[in-house]
């Protein structure tokens, strides 16, 4: 079939039909890209959006049950999603163990060991207690 495109008027000739390029007047939303159709247009949506005009939010929580790790709760949002992490975890997908040692108050000279949502202090000789703040009576 004869196919001709006249750039000045955005006209396509397919056989004996005249098909106008509908993309100049498109209304693709949320980053959608217009793709001309026969007497209409379609929208190619970014991953976070769907629907004929990219107006429907994709529910990533439904599509990716493991979007949030380590017990985090997935919260769908317009154009994306977020994770509500349980204590001890952080990051976009709750995959990062919070460094509890950064806020720990182990006595100087002791060694902090990071755990999930907690920390422990490894005491040097002669010290005891959770924070190694006590003198170890056994070593006196």
């Amino acid at each position: 079939a004869h196919h001709h495109h006249h750039h000045g008027e955005n006209l396509y000739f397919q056989g004996s039909e005249r098909n106008i390029d509908d993309c100049p007047n498109h209304r693709c939303q949320n980053g959608g890209v217009c793709v001309d159709g026969v007497n209409t247009y379609n929208c190619r949506c970014p991953p976070q959006w769907t629907g004929q005009f990219c107006t429907e939010d994709v529910d990533e929580c439904l599509l990716q049950p493991n979007a949030c790790q380590n017990g985090g709760t997935c919260a769908n949002r317009n154009g994306g999603y977020g994770c509500v992490c349980v204590n001890g975890w952080s990051g976009d997908d709750c995959s990062e163990n919070i460094d509890d040692c950064a806020f720990a108050s182990c006595t100087p000279g002791s060694t902090c060991i990071d755990r999930v949502a907690s920390f422990s202090c490894m005491c040097p000789e002669g010290k005891a207690g959770l924070l190694c703040h006590l003198d170890d009576a056994g070593n006196s």
Epitope: P24, N25, R27, C28, F53
Partner: antibody, heavy 120, light 107 residues
């Protein structure tokens, strides 16, 4: 909170020019289509011009009644939309509204409007 | 351009009444229809988008329906604050076009 505030309206003679501004806040300006809509006194709403978002290269569309006379533009650094109106006619007299196209094929936020009067 | 035929142009009703406004488009707009409320001296306010979806903060007495070329806005039980002018608008393609408006007046 999404806010749109128009300014720049006033009285102008036929053939004259005027530049309207619309300062926006509360959202990422470049992510949204922005529109100008007008309303003559006691009449209905008439769409004037649109500028698409960054994802659509900020492309522009005009109504037939203002094409070649009006120019829509935006300054992302100032979060401001503009409407430059040249060769004004008496029939351009109206309240001009700036609105946000909220990604739903609908205008979900509007400014308070600014009155443009074209009269000799 | 897509033509919008809105009816009636005005309606007199009482508080508690059910009010129905219709909008017909000259071609299929694939449910790309919005409804707005406008009060004198104020900006339009979005009520319904996507033909049937209620905008955040809009009372549930407002509802929209329709597809193709025929659309309806219904106010199930008219309240004193609902007396205003209502407009339909197609968002399928530019130029955006609005219906002529329906003024809801107190009977």
């Amino acid at each position: 909170e999404v806010q749109l505030v128009e300014s720049g309206g006033g009285l102008v003679q036929p053939g004259g020019s005027l530049k309207l501004s619309c300062a926006v806040s509360g959202f990422t300006f470049s992510d949204f289509y922005m529109e100008w809509v007008r309303q003559a006194s006691g009449k209905g709403l008439e769409w004037v011009a649109a500028q698409r978002n960054k994802a659509n290269d900020f492309s522009i569309v005009y109504s037939a009644s203002v094409k070649d006379r009006f120019t829509i533009s935006r300054d992302d650094s100032k979060s401001t939309l503009y409407l430059q109106m040249n060769s004004l006619k008496t029939e351009d007299t109206a309240v001009y509204y700036c609105s946000r196209d909220g990604g739903k094929l609908a205008l979900d936020a509007w400014g308070q409007g600014t009155l443009v009067t074209v009269s000799s | 351009d897509i033509q919008m035929t809105q009816s009636p142009s005005s309606v007199s009703a009482s508080v508690g009444d059910r009010v129905t406004i219709t909008c017909q488009t000259s071609e299929d707009i694939y449910s790309g229809l919005a409804w707005y409320q406008q009060k004198p001296g104020k900006s339009p306010k979005l009520l319904i988008y996507g033909a049937s979806r209620l905008q955040d903060g809009v009372p549930s007495r407002f509802s929209g329906s329709g597809s193709g070329t025929d659309y309806t806005l219904t106010i199930s039980s008219l309240q004193p604050e609902d007396f205003a002018t209502y407009y339909c608008q197609q968002g399928f393609k530019y130029p955006l076009t609005f219906g002529g408006g329906t003024k809801v007046e107190i009977k």
